[in-house]
Amino acid sequence: GILNLNKMVKQVTGKMPILSYWPYGCHCGLGGRGQPKDATDWCCQTHDCCYDHLKTQGCSIYKDYYRYNFSQGNIHCSDKGSWCEQQLCACDKEVAFCLKRNLDTYQKRLRFYWRPHCRGQTPGC
């Protein structure tokens, strides 16, 4: 669930998600609309799609709690849990490392970005 995601993003990026990413741009944080503002925002848009797919598969994306290990900078999703738990971990792992890959283009001005400014076509999944 959301606690897993917050912890994972903090471990991988070194940033406090609640201060740095939720919200950020047009897609990081709850909801999302319009064209992503930068590479970091694209990470979140892709993550939204990942969650949307799991929702269509009957997974409780905000309630499911999964196990994972973080060591030497890598995330290992536990293969002990249910299918949904494992897939949810995979979605979160992908966004965490995507955010890390794009730390060099992170823009402070996009934190708490005003969502009404999010215009353009919302990318499809």
Partner: antibody
């Protein structure tokens, strides 16, 4: 050859604690990815999963019974235990332990070897 | 939790007849697993990951399905197939079983 065998008290009274033991051979619970579940079956009824214990002592419980269940293991003696607190007549059933199949795909979760079962009767 | 509904609850078939047992999930699942149980015995793994036969299961058995609808099929019923069949999922926690379908020989 992998085998599992359950043992229990047979009969006990309502409000007592049910203690079950699963003794197994042919595999070790210290092996990565290994796990054992408890499953029960009331007479002439369906199967109900109760709890699972993994090689690393991680545990999962059926949420409908979680407050009453405790699963544990003794790796060196090849045994898994289940305790059910405050039993009543609805807990009368055959109790099975079963090994989770060793999987080549992470999301696989089914049981490839089952014990013969132990019958437990709870009297009021 | 995901509820698995098996139908029919009880059925009978002649030797040589094709048999289909259904398992409907209350929400979409990724895979279904099946067990066979005979009176006085413990369940045996029968079909795993929807369509793969467990070791020793005759080739007349098959499994199929996706989403919320899964089935176990016997192409030609034999006397030894008379048993109760259970479906099981672990798409989401907790792991659940269907109530079973009792298959009898006519």
């Amino acid at each position: 050859q992998v085998t599992l065998k359950e043992s229990g008290p047979g009969i006990l009274q309502s409000s007592q604690t049910l203690s079950l033991t699963c003794s197994f051979s042919g595999f070790s619970l210290s092996t990565s990815r290994m796990g054992v579940s408890w499953i029960r079956q009331p007479s002439r009824k369906g199967l109900e999963w109760l709890a699972h214990i993994y090689w690393d002592d991680d545990k999962r419980y059926n949420p409908s019974l979680k407050s009453r269940l405790t699963i544990s293991k003794d790796t060196s003696r090849n045994q898994v235990f289940l305790r059910i607190n405050n039993v009543d007549t609805a807990d009368t059933a055959t109790y099975y332990c079963a090994r989770r199949a060793l999987y080549d795909y992470g999301a696989d979760f089914y049981f490839d070897v089952w014990g013969t079962g132990t019958t437990v009767t709870v009297s009021s | 939790q995901i509820v698995l509904t098996q139908s029919p609850a009880i059925m009978s078939a002649f030797p040589g007849e094709k048999v289909t047992i259904s398992c409907s999930a209350s929400s979409s699942v990724s895979y279904m697993y099946w067990y066979q149980q005979k009176p006085g015995s413990s369940p045996k793994p029968w079909i795993y990951r929807t369509s793969n036969l467990a070791s020793g299961v005759p080739a007349r058995f098959s499994g199929s399905g996706s989403g919320t609808s899964y089935s176990l099929t016997i192409s030609s019923m034999e006397a030894e197939d008379a048993a109760t069949y259970y479906c099981q999922q672990y798409h989401t926690y907790p792991l659940t079983f269907g109530a079973g379908t009792k298959l009898e020989l006519k």
